[in-house]
């Protein structure tokens, strides 16, 4: 677990200032509003898929 | 350190009643949800009750097996978790954890404590 | 309810072996970015230890011998390399929805 601005949080979390820790964005689904979730729909996880143009 | 110390078990009668608590250290415990998970005696894990956080009115959610005769409470003032048990039966005999959760996967777990119901 | 359905119940292994568990969920537990699918490590008298978030995220602190995958319905539990302290009953839960459910286990012991 990172402080912001020393290194991001690994894919698929993001920061919570509240809880001071990196958290698992799948949580958002059951706790839409927490601060971190911001941080998961900016950077949605990589699809299962890679489509090539 | 995260800890989650369990009380109140012990030996009842039938129909009786028991209330467990869970004293909670180590991590913001108004910010996480809270769950009591049972095991009876050489068995599987079986969930029992949770109850979320004063943003949600400390709603609670009962497994079918002791709805209308559990209830979970907490006092964040106290970081405390109860599980009132009434009308008990010998099928309630278990090892009772408190767990604790931001959400989905239950991180933190207490010791245990042991509830017999028996005549 | 979602039923969860653990396989093997037990087995028997030695030390440095691949094992594998199963869990089955009677409907998906996933949508198209996560899986609400948890598992736990229980030794004998102690109380249950996480030891793998939504299908394949390891918790902090656990040893990277043990990984999990699946999506839908079916997931999996593997260590790569069972060692001493490993032997112990693995439980899988789902948090899709309430009531939260476990798999009946899967007990690992000494070969």
């Known amino acids: 677990e990172q402080a912001p601005g020393t290194a991001p949080c690994s894919r698929g979390s993001s920061w919570s200032a509240d809880l001071d820790k990196c958290m698992d964005c799948a949580s958002c689904r059951a706790r839409p509003h927490s601060d971190f979730c911001l941080g998961c729909a900016a950077a949605p996880p990589a699809p299962f898929r890679l489509l090539w143009p | 350190e995260v800890q989650l110390v369990e009380s109140g078990g012990g030996l009842v009668q039938p129909g009786g009643s028991l209330r467990l608590s869970c004293a909670a250290s180590?991590?913001?415990?108004?910010?996480?949800?809270m769950s009591w998970v049972r095991q009876a005696p050489g068995k599987g894990l079986e969930w029992v009750a949770e109850i979320r956080l004063k943003s949600d009115n400390y709603a609670t959610h009962y497994a079918e097996s002791v709805k209308g005769r559990f209830t979970i409470s907490r006092d964040d003032s106290k970081n405390s978790l109860y599980l009132q048990m009434n009308s008990l039966r010998a099928e309630d005999t278990a090892v009772y954890y408190c767990t604790g959760y931001y959400a989905d996967a239950m991180d933190y777990w207490g010791q245990g404590t042991l509830v017999t119901v028996s005549s | 309810d979602i039923q969860m359905t653990q396989s093997p119940s037990s087995l028997s292994a030695s030390v440095g072996d691949r094992v594998t568990i199963t869990c089955r969920a009677s409907q998906s537990v996933s949508t198209s970015s996560y899986s609400y699918m948890h598992w736990y490590q229980q030794k004998p008298g102690k109380a249950p230890k996480l030891l793998i978030k939504?299908?394949?995220n390891l918790e902090s602190g656990v040893p990277s011998r043990f990984s999990g995958s699946g999506s839908g319905t079916d997931f999996t539990l593997t260590i790569s390399s069972l060692q001493p302290e490993d032997f112990a009953t693995y439980y899988c839960?789902?948090?899709?929805?309430?009531?939260?459910?476990f798999g009946g286990g899967t007990k690992v012991e000494i070969k």
């Open positions: 939504y299908a394949s």
């Open positions: 839960q789902h948090s899709w929805e309430i009531p939260y459910t």
């Open positions: 180590g991590f913001t415990f108004s910010s996480y949800w």
